[in-house]
Interface confidence: low
């Protein structure tokens, strides 16, 4: 029997994962794969040998391999499951633990820009934890999480990319950015 | 998903005048910056007007001719457009996007657009 610490395992809300058992293969001699959603501790899923197979709701899909698909992840999907697999003899062979994060994915992140006083800003409307990155003629700049702001000296013509990301999704823009000698917005 | 709507091209003789409307459906209309822009026959499209719940921005080519407006109420924004030159025969487009305030001039900073609408100024 194996009980490993809690695989920390990222999903993008609205979009499916696939929860992969690692180092395990599928034999004759499995009988039972048992997922389990611990915080209600509910089964959610279950193969059993000659018998057909179970799941809680159609948002569950049992793959042969023991692999467990969670279509359309919600925000309650955040959760520790358990998958439990016993052999015909009833042994339990193995027992994998997942911590299962979701995230929202990153909008496309906003350049926008006035040449009055060469400030240059950068932010992203929605995603889990963003972090956003500036980068001035492929030189980085900064680092902060929903807005940049930076005022450039050092022409006033730029190429500017930001890249916005988080465990589940990277978007980025970029942006040539030209001021007048004066300064007109 | 935001739709675009625009209407009120037409024909008009050089010095005359037209307005433009663009109608915004499916989000919360105050939270979005919308655009004009226009393109030429052999151009690349071009930045007109804009505006935001908090300020508008023009391009020189229009500045003291056209006005842009917004009528939340009615999920609407205008392009007034005054001493019709020749050179503003264009198809306009409206385009909008998410914004927390700044005045978008680039066409790649809008993630949604309207189908156009032609203008022809024209002795």
């Known amino acids: 029997k194996e009980i490993t610490n809690a695989l920390e395992t990222w999903g993008a809300l609205g979009q499916d994962i696939n929860l992969d058992i690692p180092s395990f293969q599928m034999s004759d001699d499995i009988d039972d794969i048992k997922w389990e959603k611990t915080s209600d501790k509910k089964k959610i899923a279950q193969f059993r040998k000659e018998k057909e197979t179970f799941k809680e709701k159609d948002t569950y899909k049992l793959f042969k391999n023991g692999t467990l698909k969670i279509k359309h992840l919600k925000t309650d999907d955040q959760d520790i499951y358990k998958v439990s697999i016993y052999d015909t003899k009833g042994k339990n062979v193995l027992e994998k633990i997942f911590d299962l994060k979701i995230q929202e994915r990153v909008s496309k992140p906003k350049i926008s820009w006035t040449c009055i006083n060469t400030t240059l800003t950068c932010e992203v409307m929605n995603g889990t934890d963003p972090e956003l990155n500036l980068y001035q003629d492929g030189k980085h700049l900064k680092l902060s999480q929903r807005v940049i702001t930076h005022k450039w000296t050092t022409s006033l013509s730029a190429k500017f990319k930001c890249t916005a990301g988080n465990k589940v999704s990277k978007e980025s823009s970029v942006e040539p950015v030209s001021c007048p000698e004066k300064g007109l917005d | 998903q935001v739709q675009l709507q625009e209407s009120g091209g037409g024909s008009v003789q050089p010095g005359g005048s037209l307005r433009l409307s663009c109608t915004v459906s499916?989000?919360?209309?105050?939270?979005?910056?919308v655009g004009w822009f226009r393109q030429a026959p052999g151009k690349e499209r071009e930045f007109v007007a804009t505006?935001?719940?908090?300020?508008?921005a023009y391009a020189d080519s229009v500045k003291g001719r056209f006005t842009i407006s917004r009528d939340n109420a009615k999920n609407t924004v205008y392009l007034q457009m005054n001493s019709l030159k020749p050179e503003d025969t264009a198809v306009y487009y409206c385009?909008?996007?998410?914004?927390?305030?700044?005045?978008?001039?680039?066409?790649?900073?809008?993630?949604?657009w309207g189908q156009g609408t032609q203008v022809t100024v024209s002795s």
């Open positions: 499916g989000r919360t209309f105050s939270n979005y910056a």
């Open positions: 505006i935001t719940g908090s300020g508008t």
């Open positions: 385009a909008a996007t998410w914004s927390s305030g700044y005045t978008f001039r680039s066409p790649t900073q809008y993630d949604y």
